[in-house]
Interface confidence: low
Amino acid sequence: EEELQVIQPEKSVSVAAGDSATLNCTVSSLIPVGPIQWFRGAGPGRELIYNLKEGHFPRVTPVSDPTKRNNMDFSIRISNITPADAGTYYCVKFRKGSPDVELKSGAGTELSVRAKPSAPVVSGPAVRATAEHTVSFTCESHGFSPRDITLKWFKNGNELSDVQTNVDPAGKSVSYSIRSTARVVLTRRDVHSQVICEVAHVTLQGDPLRGTANLSEAIRVPPFLEVTQQSMRADNQVNVTCQVTKFYPQRLQLTWLENGNVSRTEMASALPENKDGTYNWTSWLLVNVSAHRDDVKLTCQVEHDGQPAVNKSFSVKVSAHPKEQGSNTAAENTGTNERNIY
């Protein structure tokens, strides 16, 4: 008699997560008498997926009525597929007995599950960096299948090239994760800049997922300091101005020192934003020249975002009297702007 064949026509089937998978199996003969069972995997550790005779398999249903006479179609449908269902499924014929004896297995159908990647999560550096420094951003997405995936980085719409990307694991798995690091060189104009991590996958139908991060969270733009002395007033008072410009973030403390002694401390708050996202702040100090016999050394000291202080000092000459109303005494700038120490 002709040898019984167990035919699984599809070597592989691919299904989107959440959908149903149909695994086809037919036999070439009704004899010998005995049941069909479905297993995932082979060998002693195989997992029983469906047994017509007994057991409770809520997600598995036969495609045709296996109880009807002369039925040779033992295909099954598995509903609500998840990545954990991936694997090779075998349709196995048993010969009726006590116990039933395994007679023949189909060649197996590999079920692969197409699962969407999770929304990319972008994280930036733990501490701020200044312009011309390089910072790293990391993008992660998980739970996708198949393994093939494309990840791109953009800064203000321009693709970044200094990127390192890994997909894990290297071998076969029910689902995969991607982690990518992009290195970005900061500029002073980057307060309003944004980096985007874009993930494309076969499950997304050409509509990639994006994760974003604002460079404002990663950048520190140190201030420029400029100190100027206004005209001498009739009441022998000099108005000295400290202009602090182009800084970010807003967290800034300004201290005036007269001959090394603290005169006044101010904190920046509710400042208007420049077009490039930075801030400016102007502070002034009135110095009563007639109260001093010697020249007065004034220092504008700025602490920005917890960084070491930046000083700008100059001397107000009090020896050169009389003081004509409307005369303009230039400040002698004896300080240095130490912005580059960060």
Epitope: D148, T150, G171
Partner: antibody, heavy 123, light 107 residues
Framework: QIQLVQSGSELKKPGASVKVSCRAR????????MNWVRQAPGQGLEWMGF????????TYAQGFKGRFVFSLDTSVSTAYLQIGSLKAEDTAVYYC????????????????WGQGTLVTVSS | DIQMTQSPSSLSASVGDRVTITCRAS??????LAWYQQKPGKSPKALIF???YRYIGVPSRFSGSGSGTDFTLTISSLQPEDFATYYC?????????FGQGTKLEIK
């Protein structure tokens, strides 16, 4: 039935280039990755890399970066291997081989192979 | 790269013999291992994937086993058409690598 049909043997001079084709029959080219494998005369099998037929993105093994280019023309279900600046040591049979597994672009076991294309480089 | 070492490099056997070819990986490849048969002048033919699963149409006398680093291909009863060169291949990690081959000859 499923077949990978490769172009015929080539005899080339050193410095020339060659383009080997591999046509997929009996299945959809873009459902399976296409690998390229080299076998020098009397030697074993050496994996050159593969092309993701869905995105067109090639992956090259270390010794095959630069002069070797994998490409596709999905309109004619064909993958190509181009070798530039041929050297005598490029003389070998080149096989295309399909990766097992639907939508599996990640290398893997090769269930179907082309018949091979002998490329001979000689002056 | 993962090195795949087959042993023996060649062996002679007779029709009806049971033959075992071993393949050792230089690091763990799980069960991501395949076996191929190649006859002179022909392209390789896939026999086994995932270390132990036969492809459709491959006779049941061919079986594979193993996981991790040690694998075997067993031919339970040699047939005349089985004399060929056999290769193992790991596909756990890039680059994919093959063993050097085992030539099975008629005694």
């Amino acid at each position: 039935q499923i077949q990978l049909v490769q172009s015929g043997s080539e005899l080339k001079k050193p410095g020339a280039s060659v383009k080997v084709s591999c046509r997929a029959r009996g299945y959809t080219l873009t459902d399976y990755a296409m690998n390229w494998v080299r076998q020098a005369p009397g030697q074993g099998l050496e994996w050159m890399g593969f092309i993701n037929t869905y995105t067109g993105e090639p992956t090259y093994a270390q010794g095959f970066k630069g002069r070797f280019v994998f490409s596709l023309d999905t309109s004619v279900s064909t993958a190509y291997l181009q070798i530039g600046s041929l050297k005598a040591e490029d003389t070998a049979v080149y096989y295309c081989a399909r990766t097992r597994g639907y939508y599996d672009f990640d290398g893997g076991a090769f269930d179907y192979w082309g018949q091979g294309t002998l490329v001979t480089v000689s002056s | 790269d993962i090195q795949m070492t087959q042993s023996p490099s060649s062996l002679s056997a007779s029709v009806g013999d049971r033959v075992t070819i071993t393949c050792r990986a230089s690091q763990n490849v799980g069960t991501h291992l395949a076996w191929y048969q190649q006859k002179p002048g022909k392209s390789p033919k896939a026999l086994i994937f995932s270390a132990s699963y036969r492809y459709i149409g491959v006779p049941s006398r061919f079986s594979g086993s193993g996981s991790g680093t040690d694998f075997t291909l067993t031919i339970s009863s040699l047939q005349p058409e089985d004399f060929a060169t056999y290769y193992c291949q790991q596909y756990n990690t890039y680059p994919l690598t093959f063993g050097q081959g085992t030539k099975l000859e008629i005694k």
